[in-house]
């Protein structure tokens, strides 16, 4: 969801507000309020289930929690698509499905979730610790990807939402640190608002900031699965074919990781019939990648009529993986 972090221009404070509630003190609550209000970002959840009937058969379900419209979903295994992963299926909401062995049946479950059944025979069949990733390209959010795998100990037939890998990366510490600061800021803001609720509110002028200025993309652990720590692209190493990466690097680059964290999780939007997607409690190993804003001079890939894709930091072929785009 693209939001604008614009701090409203303030009129000079009322005479009674000089002193303790000075200009600097007034600006801070508005900055924090804007951050708190615009702090919601989309998320992707992934659920991996081993079928009780066929021990080597898997069902992968993925969903997008965001208000945008999905333009493409790519499911891969062995790590994120474009970072060592192999594409299993590409699903377009209007144009259909391309799938690859061992995918048996890919399909849309709702407007914002898909499922993929993998068959369990042959050299390319998955095993219990294979990592599966789902990448959602959406408008206007950009590209968001999450990965998950079935814990080796899970009982067949039971839904075993993936748990994060035990790999904490340096960037994560930074993200959590900033999350803490923002959380503290929001609490402080509430405190300020309570303290000063009897004072007159400052008059706002229309902002002179360009409405086109994009806010920095943000990431943080979601409330949708509070008990689980969401590790960006930390995948579980597997002995299965294809080999996965111990750590798949975030595609957005270091500059992306310097952006602000968020706390609000978005619920699926749209008709009620589509909104019944069960969100796996606690188990979604959620990580995100933002490919929304093109770098200067970067040309968006040709998508043809009706297909809206956004530039991926890795270039025009990244969106489709092995399904090459010109």
């Amino acid at each position: 969801m693209r939001t604008e972090a614009q701090v409203p221009a303030l009129q000079p404070p009322e005479p009674g507000l000089e002193g303790a509630m000075g200009h600097r003190t007034l600006v801070l609550p508005w900055v924090l309020l804007t951050l708190c209000v615009t702090a919601g970002t989309p998320e992707v959840w992934v659920q991996v289930r081993m079928e009780a009937t066929e021990l080597s058969s898997f069902t992968i379900r993925c969903g997008f929690l965001g208000s945008g419209s999905i333009s493409l979903v790519t499911v891969s295994w062995g790590g994120p698509n474009g970072a060592g992963g192999t594409t299993l299926a590409v699903l377009h909401p209007e144009r259909g499905i391309r799938q690859w062995a061992p995918a048996r049946q890919a399909r849309w479950e709702t407007q914002s979730s898909i499922s993929l059944i993998l068959e369990g025979s042959g050299a390319s069949s998955p095993c219990a610790n294979t990592t599966f990733c789902c990448k959602f390209a959406s408008f206007p959010e950009g590209s968001w990807e999450a990965c998950g795998s079935l814990p080796p100990s899970s009982d067949p037939g039971l839904s075993a939402p993936p748990t994060p890998a035990p790999i904490l990366r340096a960037d994560l510490a930074g993200i959590l640190g900033v999350s803490g600061v923002l959380l503290f800021g929001c609490v402080y803001l509430l405190h300020l608002l309570r303290r000063h609720k009897h004072r007159p509110a400052p008059r706002l002028q229309p902002s002179r900031t360009s409405p086109q200025a994009p806010r920095a993309r943000a990431w943080a652990p979601s409330q949708a699965s509070q008990a689980a720590l969401h590790v960006p692209y930390a995948t579980i190493n597997t002995s299965c074919r294809p080999a996965t990466l111990d750590t798949a690097h975030p595609h957005g680059g270091p500059s992306w990781w310097a952006s602000l964290p968020t706390h609000a999780a978005h619920r699926p939007q749209g008709p009620a019939a589509w909104a019944s997607t069960p969100i796996p409690a606690r188990g979604s190993f959620v990580s995100v990648e933002n490919g929304l804003y093109a770098q200067a001079g970067e040309r968006p890939p040709h998508t043809g009529p009706g297909l809206t894709l956004f530039p991926d930091p890795r270039g025009p072929r990244a969106m489709e993986g092995p399904l090459g785009v010109r």
Epitope: T87, E94, W100, Q105, G304, P305, P322, L323, G324
Partner: antibody, heavy 119, light 107 residues
Framework: EVQLQQSGPELAKPGSSVKISCKAS????????IDWVKQSHGKSLEWIGA????????NYNQKFKGKATLTVDKSSSTAYMELRSLTSEDSAVYYC????????????WATGTTVTVSS | DIVMTQSQKFMSTSVGDRVSITCKAS??????VDWYQQKPGQSPKALIF???NRHTGVPDRFTGSGSGTDFTLTIRNVQSEDLADYFC?????????FGGGTKLEIR
């Protein structure tokens, strides 16, 4: 000019195998999937399966699993389809076609290879 | 598998007429339907993709419409070179399936 050139007609005995080739030119071979389609005499078209030359991933119509095997040779920009355990039911024209993954359709078709199975 | 039904096996028309060829999917396939033309003794050629988009070089006499389960290929101002078989194809789900074809005859 983008072209797919298929090998010539095949006359085969029941129980034997044939391998049809499809040579691509005029574009980067690994940028597009190659799909195969069967057309029996006087009948409609049947989709056999697809191969991604980029990584050899395949997807088969369940009906043709065990009958058709799709492979590629990147060095010669050629896709192959092997048909085994041939019966008279396999007598047909087989087409290779290029899948445009930008626009999601078969944008280029080869001229086809006629396979006749007869004892 | 999704079944694509082209109920008219043959259609007869005259040069200059307008003709509509229909295709019905056994389930909702959104706009994941293409139309292909196969002239006698030739391989199929793309006409329309994603229900309504014309392939490069296809005359604007050919138009596609529909979504969900009902699709139509309309040829207006029919020409003698339009004598051919016309097939619809769905790629909403694997395996992709073609309609049985409609043979257009010019009176």
């Amino acid at each position: 000019e983008v072209q797919l050139q298929q090998s010539g007609p095949e006359l085969a005995k029941p129980g034997s195998s044939v391998k049809i080739s499809c040579k691509a030119s005029g574009y980067t071979f690994t940028d597009y999937n190659i799909d195969w389609v069967k057309q029996s005499h006087g009948k409609s078209l049947e989709w056999i399966g697809a191969i991604d030359p980029n990584n050899d991933s395949t997807n088969y119509n369940q009906k043709f699993k065990g009958k058709a095997t799709l492979t590629v040779d990147k060095s010669s920009s050629t896709a192959y389809m092997e048909l085994r355990s041939l019966t008279s039911e396999d007598s047909a024209v087989y087409y290779c076609t290029r899948w445009d993954s930008d626009d999601w359709y078969f944008d280029v078709w080869a001229t086809g290879t006629t396979v006749t199975v007869s004892s | 598998d999704i079944v694509m039904t082209q109920s008219q096996k043959f259609m007869s028309t005259s040069v200059g007429d307008r003709v509509s060829i229909t295709c019905k999917a056994s389930q909702n396939v959104r706009s994941a339907v293409d139309w292909y033309q196969q002239k006698p003794g030739q391989s199929p050629k793309a006409l329309i993709f994603s229900s309504s988009n014309r392939h490069t070089g296809v005359p604007d006499r050919f138009t596609g419409s529909g979504s969900g389960t009902d699709f139509t290929l309309t040829i207006r101002n029919v020409q003698s070179e339009d004598l051919a078989d016309y097939f619809c194809l769905q790629h909403w789900n694997s395996p992709y399936t073609f309609g049985g074809g409609t043979k257009l005859e010019i009176r």
